[in-house]
């Protein structure tokens, strides 16, 4: 059973979210569960470090994009939000919070501002921003 959920503040159009936890989960209360991942969008604007701390306090991390297929709902995300991607100046790579390197062709990274942190924007775009800029953020938790 699928529920057609239209979350006007989060998505550009209707997205299909499973109704029962037998398909997905468990997730913290009021989080979105989709293809074995739990997501929550936080409206308060924080810098990257504060956003990371907020996610960690909920046993989660900032959004990690690892698969366009498993995370296809991210295509439709409205606006732009902090994700867990940081630039490592020493080797020039982009790295997730868990230390893994951004896979090629997963995100279109565009330099909107001089900075070492990245915002997630719809259709798998990453916007480079100054880490101290306040923005909304997305936390993510992998289900077991």
């Amino acid at each position: 059973i699928w529920s057609a959920v239209f979350l006007n503040s989060l998505f550009n159009q209707e997205v299909q979210i499973p109704l029962t936890e037998s398909y997905c989960g468990p997730c913290p209360k009021n989080w979105i569960c989709y293809k074995n991942n739990c997501y929550q969008f936080f409206d308060e604007s924080k810098n990257w470090y504060e956003s990371q701390a907020s996610c960690m306090s909920q046993n989660a991390s900032l959004l990690k994009v690892y698969s366009k297929e498993d995370q296809d709902l991210l295509k439709l995300v409205k606006s732009y939000h902090w994700m867990g991607l940081v630039h490592i100046p020493t080797n020039g790579s982009w790295q997730w919070e868990d230390g893994s390197i951004l896979s090629p062709n997963l995100l279109t990274i565009i330099e909107m501002q001089k900075g070492d942190c990245a915002l997630y924007a719809s259709s798998f775009k990453g916007y480079i921003e100054n880490c101290s800029t306040p923005n909304t953020y997305i936390c993510m938790q992998r289900t077991v």
């Epitope: 604007s45 606006s79 732009y80 279109t108 330099e111 909107m112 100054n130 800029t133 306040p134 923005n135």
Partner: antibody, heavy 115, light 108 residues
């Protein structure tokens, strides 16, 4: 679809400050980055700068010392201020939103710098 | 900054013909972050192509983009009367974002 409308004086005196506002037709001000681009008569396009809804701005270095872009999310507007203008700043000024590129543009407003 | 040079400056063609417009960058444009715009007299530019080869929403398939690195091409497979206009390329791989000087496609 979002619609953009520039407004402001069409004539500015040399050494004064040019001020323009772009009004966004819906509440999408928090969904995109917002840009200003200009085009002198009979010439090409020049990117001035852009701003996020949170106020983080990036400017063209050639104009950085004179330009300020600001945003007012409560009014669904963003603004351009260009100080110490000269005749070389005479141009059509466009506002645009940034998504995959400059996707949607205002119709443009002509600003003449003359005494 | 990256300087974009478009050629030719003017292209004189007849409706139904193929138009090939070139945009050359002074240094490599990272990840093919190049867009093409069409501008008609008295109008704002309109986005045609982004990411060097992706068509923007509502753009007819007679418009196609290609290229990478420093050399990019916009092709109009069969010119329609409404395609006669000025075309600009723009890079967004490196700040400051820059435009080419434009190519005018006029009726022969």
């Amino acid at each position: 679809q979002v619609h953009l409308q520039e407004s402001g004086p069409g004539l500015v005196k040399p050494s004064e400050t040019l001020s323009l506002t772009c009004t966004v037709s819906d509440d999408s001000i928090s969904s995109y980055y917002w840009s200003w681009i200009r085009q002198p008569p009979g010439k090409g396009l020049e990117w001035i700068g852009h701003i996020s809804y949170s106020g983080s701005a990036n400017y063209n270095p050639s104009l950085k010392s004179r330009v300020t872009i600001s945003v007012d999310t409560s009014k669904n507007q963003f603004s351009l201020k260009l100080s110490s203008v000269t005749a070389a700043d005479t141009a059509v000024y466009y506002c645009a939103n940034w998504d995959d590129a400059f996707n949607i543009w205002g119709q443009g407003t002509m600003v003449t710098v003359s005494s | 900054e990256i300087v974009l040079t478009q050629s030719p400056g003017t292209l004189s063609l007849s409706p139904g013909e193929r138009a090939t417009l070139s945009c050359r960058a002074s240094q490599s444009v990272s990840s093919s972050y190049l867009a093409w715009y069409q501008q008609k007299p008295g109008q704002a530019p309109r986005l045609l192509i982004y990411g060097a080869s992706s068509r923007a929403t509502g753009i007819p398939d007679r418009f196609s983009g290609s290229g990478s690195g420093t050399d990019f091409t916009l092709t109009i497979s069969r010119l329609e009367p409404e395609d006669f206009a000025v075309y600009y390329c723009q890079q967004y791989g490196s700040s400051p974002w820059t435009f080419g000087q434009g190519t005018k496609v006029e009726i022969k």
